[in-house]
């Protein structure tokens, strides 16, 4: 005998509270196939989530985030502030990058400058807070008389180490 | 679509135990959370862990749970995973799998549970 | 860590009586509440969701409210059937390191 609730399409349900006819899902649920029993509870997209895709009868809602913030987590199961280019997100807020790391996106942590000389380099371009370092030619590559450019180690600046 | 719970079973204290959690009916490709839900006898529903069976596999856990308890998947299978270790008396349950498409906690679709009891 | 609180943790009420279920959370939650019945040696039963939406295949004769922290379910005439217990969850997903999830201690409803 084949199974009455094979017959209901995606966006109904079987139910067994009315002999098993298939029933439109209730409103903010869907069913993605056909022959379910239950449907499925849409995703809402409230607060700080900003609706992507829309929920139908059939499919799930999407979501994204509000300007100045972005998505993180499965399915954007979580929306996380914005800062600015070097910049890192604590528990206190966006705090600039430490002297010696840099954060060169809206999102993430602040890392170490990349260490030139571990790969026998010079440093080329000084490392700020947005950008890392650039490491120039190893010294022996130098032309006699060429000076890689070695700036004098600067003042630390204050830092915010992540809460 | 159905979830079925096995796996459970007495164990000493201290011991090991992994429950699986087998999904039909759909696919773990879908854009499902699914969750472990405990409930000791006589006692209300305890939140466990959760996976996202969609691409990133992104896992979160009860404080109860974290350090002792690992959720994973197995997407070939359509099983869902519990590796319990350290058991404790307390850890004895009836353990539940349920699907949430909401992303709030919000469970349409329940296994029967499987039952876990911690014992000398 | 979210709390969910519910009373009362027994009812004693007659078939077609109409029954309210308190729930309230230890911060706003929005309407990211559920309701779930459930029965000696079964799984939960989803009911509500959102705090007020209707799960398929449940009787109108349940319904549900509230927002925030405070949130009623209430059964506008017991039926045989209905006597069970009930449970409340609230939650969202926000950090591994941080996440929220919770089931009141449930309210048992009984025959008078």
């Known amino acids: 005998l084949q199974d009455p609730c094979s017959n209901c399409p995606a966006g109904t349900f079987c139910d067994n509270n009315r002999n098993q006819i298939c029933s439109p899902c209730p409103p903010n649920s869907f069913s993605s196939a056909g022959g379910q029993r239950t449907c499925d509870i849409c995703r809402q997209c409230k607060g700080v989530f900003r609706t992507r895709k829309e929920c139908s009868s059939t499919s799930n809602a999407e979501c994204d985030c509000t300007p100045g913030f972005h998505c993180l987590g499965a399915g954007c199961s979580m929306c996380e502030q914005d800062c600015k280019q070097g910049q890192e997100l604590t528990k206190k807020g966006c705090k600039d990058c430490c002297f010696g790391t840099f954060n060169d996106q809206k999102r993430g942590i602040c890392r170490p400058w990349t260490n030139c000389s571990l790969d026998g380099k010079s440093v080329l371009v000084n490392g700020t807070k947005e950008r890392d370092v650039v490491c120039g030619p190893s010294p022996a590559d130098l032309s006699p008389g060429a000076s890689s450019v070695t700036p004098p180690a600067p003042a630390r600046e204050p830092g915010h180490s992540p809460q | 679509q159905s979830l079925v719970e096995s796996g459970g079973g007495l164990v000493q204290p201290g011991g090991s135990l992994r429950l699986s959690c087998a999904a039909s009916?759909?696919?773990?490709?879908?854009?499902?959370?699914i969750c472990w839900v405990r409930q000791a006898p006589g006692k209300g529903l305890e939140w466990i862990a959760c996976?996202?069976?969609?691409?990133?596999?992104?896992?979160y856990y009860a404080s109860s749970a974290k350090g002792r308890f690992t959720i994973s998947r197995d997407n070939s299978k359509n099983t869902l995973y519990l590796q319990m270790n350290s058991l404790r008396a307390e850890d004895t349950a009836v353990y539940y799998c349920?699907?949430?498409?909401?992303?709030?906690?919000?469970?349409?679709?329940w296994g029967q549970g499987t039952l876990v009891t911690v014992s000398s | 860590a979210l709390v969910m609180t519910q009373s009362p943790s027994t009812l004693s009420a007659s078939v077609g009586d109409r029954v309210t279920i308190n729930c309230q959370a230890s911060?706003?939650?929005?309407?990211?509440l559920a309701w779930y019945q459930q029965k000696p040696g079964k799984a939960p039963k989803l009911l509500i969701f959102?705090?007020?939406d209707l799960a398929s295949g449940v009787p109108s004769r349940f319904s549900g409210s509230g927002s925030g922290t405070e949130f009623t379910l209430t059964i506008s005439s017991l039926q045989p059937d209905d006597f069970a217990t009930y449970y409340c969850?609230?939650?969202?997903?926000?950090?591994?390191?941080?996440?929220?999830?919770?089931f009141g201690g449930g309210t048992k409803v009984e025959i008078k």
């Open positions: 349920a699907r949430d498409s909401s992303s709030y906690y919000m469970f349409n679709l």
């Open positions: 009916g759909f696919s773990f490709s879908s854009n499902y959370w």
């Open positions: 911060e706003d939650i929005d309407t990211y």
């Open positions: 996976i996202y069976v969609g691409s990133s596999g992104d896992t």
């Open positions: 959102y705090a007020s």
């Open positions: 969850q609230g939650g969202y997903y926000t950090s591994s390191a941080d996440t929220r999830g919770a």
